[in-house]
């Protein structure tokens, strides 16, 4: 069954997905798709990376992390209820049927009505958008610099705790990285 992540309407949703490149710059193609991972590739592709860059993206879908270090977590900007559903992160490891597939379930909740205005984190300021329109070719990337690693063996329950998008964002802001693969 899919791991569940939550966000509110109007927020940015964060869906974590990571791998460890065999060597710096030795990247593995990754696709993100809407819908559970199929037998080959991704279904309705929203973003792709190749061995060098993000080479395909669609509006509102982008990578905040340093994908050159294997952080291919997906951010969906300004979510609506229609963004609910299963997303596939597919790490396309060379060789036949070697891909790692992760199905992540995104649940969008209606925005909370609060009597007093609350301070919202400015994601655009904190993490300038890397890509927001459909396109191809090389892209300038905003990296987060050198981050400390948290290994899965060190924190086995972190993935479950990441289910709330805001918690996920806080963890990411503090520099936590899950290593998969």
């Amino acid at each position: 069954s899919e791991v569940e992540y939550r966000a509110e309407v109007g927020q940015n949703a964060y869906l974590p997905c990571f791998y460890t490149p065999a060597a710096p710059g030795n990247l593995v193609p990754v696709c993100w798709g809407k819908g559970a991972c199929p037998v080959f590739e991704c279904g309705n592709v929203v973003l792709r990376t190749d061995e060098r860059d993000v080479n395909y993206w669609t509006s509102r879908y982008w990578l905040n992390g340093d994908f050159r270090k294997g952080d291919v977590s997906l951010t969906i900007e300004n979510v609506t209820l229609a963004d609910s559903g299963i997303y596939c992160c597919r790490i396309q490891i060379p060789g036949i049927m070697n891909d790692e597939k992760f199905n992540l379930k995104l649940v969008i909740k209606p925005a909370k009505v609060t009597p007093a205005p609350t301070r919202q984190r400015d994601f655009t300021a904190a993490f300038p958008r890397m890509l927001t329109t459909r396109g191809h070719g090389p892209a300038e990337t905003q990296t987060l610099g050198s981050l400390p690693d948290i290994n899965l063996t060190q924190i086995s329950t972190l993935a479950n705790e990441l289910r709330d998008s805001r918690l996920a964002n806080d963890l990411r802001d503090s520099g936590a990285t899950i290593r998969i693969g």
């Epitope: 819908g35 199929p38 080959f40 590739e41 991704c42 279904g43 592709v45 049927m97």
Partner: antibody, heavy 121, light 107 residues
């Protein structure tokens, strides 16, 4: 208009070989996975093999992978299926099908009319 | 391999009827299912992918639904050109597998 035209079928003796071809037009061939699917007389459809966009990954039905080889030539917009050590049970209509688009979608949106392969002594 | 059980195997209906064809997978396939149409003497044609997405150019009277292991193709109002054989295909797990087909005939 998307067109897929198979050729190369025919009558062959058991143990023989055939090479099927599929000429594609009307779309950017290199943006799509391609597949071969077959249908034996009076039987259902059976997926045979897939090939990814640039030919670097190929996938086969387990029972066929030692005898069949799928390949493609993107410069010629062509898909191929080399069939060796043919058996009577390989008798079928072989279809070329356009597979998954680089950006997602249907695995089998467009098909050719098929080419009949008959394996008989 | 995932087995796809399609029903009914044949169906008689009239122009204007609402028709439903079902496919049951031997295990959950998370909407990774497509529906195909084959008219006599014509090539197969994709109608629906990922359970409910209409292929370009397919009339809106066709729709797909379902979840888990059970999926449905519905034609809301049959037209003369819809009489054909319909197949489901799963692409959730290797290898892709097909249903046995439903032949839709004029009553």
């Amino acid at each position: 208009e998307v067109q897929l035209v198979e050729s190369g079928g025919g009558l062959v003796k058991p143990g023989g070989s055939l090479r099927l071809s599929c000429a594609a037009s009307g779309f950017t061939f290199s943006d799509y996975y391609m597949a071969w699917v077959r249908q034996a007389p009076g039987k259902g459809l059976e997926w045979v093999a897939n090939i990814n966009y640039d030919g670097s990954n190929t996938y086969y039905l387990d029972s066929l992978k030692s005898r069949f080889t799928i390949s493609r030539d993107n410069a010629k917009n062509s898909l191929y299926l080399q069939m060796n050590s043919l058996r009577a049970e390989d008798t079928a209509v072989y279809y070329c099908a356009r597979g998954l688009y680089y950006y997602g979608g249907n695995y089998f949106a467009y098909w050719g009319q098929g080419t009949l392969v008959t394996v008989s002594s | 391999d995932i087995q796809m059980t399609q029903s009914p195997s044949s169906l008689s209906a009239s122009v204007g009827d609402r028709v439903t064809i079902t496919c049951h997978a031997s295990q959950g396939i998370s909407s990774n299912i497509g529906w195909l149409q084959q008219k006599p003497g014509k090539a197969f044609k994709g109608l629906i992918y990922q359970g409910s997405n209409l292929e370009d150019g397919v009339p809106s009277r066709f729709s797909g639904s379902g979840s888990g292991a059970d999926y449905t193709l519905t034609i809301s109002s049959l037209q003369p050109e819809d009489f054909a054989t319909y197949y489901c295909v799963q692409f959730a797990q290797f290898p892709p597998t097909f249903g046995q087909g439903t032949k839709l005939e004029i009553k």
